[in-house]
Amino acid sequence: MAVTACQGLGFVVSLIGIAGIIAATCMDQWSTQDLYNNPVTAVFNYQGLWRSCVRESSGFTECRGYFTLLGLPAMLQAVRALMIVGIVLGAIGLLVSIFALKCIRIGSMEDSAKANMTLTSGIMFIVSGLCAIAGVSVFANMLVTNFWMSTANMYTGMGGMVQTVQTRYTFGAALFVGWVAGGLTLIGGVMMCIACRGLAPEETNYKAVSYHASGHSVAYKPGGFKASTGFGSNTKNKKIYDGGARTEDEVQSYPSKHDYV
């Protein structure tokens, strides 16, 4: 029961985490600027992984996808890659974990198979969470190192000049969403791995055979020694005594009135 609860909770926590990672990746507010008082109007500027936006004091808001012509920080591509890898791994992990859930019966799937699938999905969630945390942390580090934009002027060939607007970069909401979501996915993955240990059956390297006296009907079958050594016709470990030797399963399936404890 505890295993089922741990597995189910791990799945739900990971699901919420991956939904959060997707949300963070799509959000525009990865970095925000302190209100920059342009002489024309107060401008609030914020950037995401895919586009940047501006909101004027009048309420007008506009977003545009990044123009590669204007150049992008090299780290932005790395962050994009980390977040996408995190989403893909998380999505695959969710798919695997659905089939691994103990409360869901699919055909005659054994517990050992479910345990393996639970472990696989758990590892995927852990890596997914780490990717998201790494992506968000790389971005945050990029903001910290560029806390105050350099205002050094760069002169163009036409006698004009271009400069970056002096502005203070602050962490956007998406960073916090990403950190929390990555953490949840990581926790969910750990819970799945813990649940896997409870699901895995204790396997023995041999099939137990119990011998029972069954009255006077014991008959010796030649080939018994051959069976035990693996030679001869009896290689499938069939019963070598008519009523005397049974596997554990057979004892439970066909109890005899002559069986002794």
Partner: nanobody, 120 residues
């Protein structure tokens, strides 16, 4: 690289009119804010007038009622119609374009300036 080229400057008598024009070239990206600044000899560069994509327009107190700014988004140009010019309007006028969207770091582009002299 976005380049701004100003034109229309010259010598004009007090009370006269001039129309300054600024054309953006080099990159087909319309800016979010376009403005005019001026710098008189021995003085700091000051804001004259500007407008945004959202339609916000602002003028410096010293030019209100005399100057009119307009913008053609399709051509990526901004014009400044200057009427009732005064000698104190004498300065080098600079065109400025600021891009906030479509770039990770907000950018401010400047033209090389055009001279406006108001003298009798």
């Amino acid at each position: 690289q976005l380049q701004l080229v100003e034109s229309g400057g010259g010598l004009v008598q007090p009370g006269g009119s001039l129309r300054l024009s600024c054309a953006a070239s080099g990159v087909d990206i319309s800016s979010d804010v376009m403005a005019w600044y001026r710098q008189a000899p021995g003085k700091q560069r000051e804001f004259v007038s500007g407008l945004t994509r959202g339609g916000s327009i602002n003028y410096a107190d010293s030019v209100k009622g005399r100057f009119t700014i307009s913008r053609d988004f399709a051509k990526n140009t901004v014009d400044l119609q200057m009427n009732s010019l005064k000698p104190e309007d004498t300065a080098v006028y600079y065109c400025n374009a600021e891009i906030y969207t479509g770039t990770f770091y907000p950018r401010s582009y400047w033209g090389q300036g055009t001279q406006v002299t108001v003298s009798s």
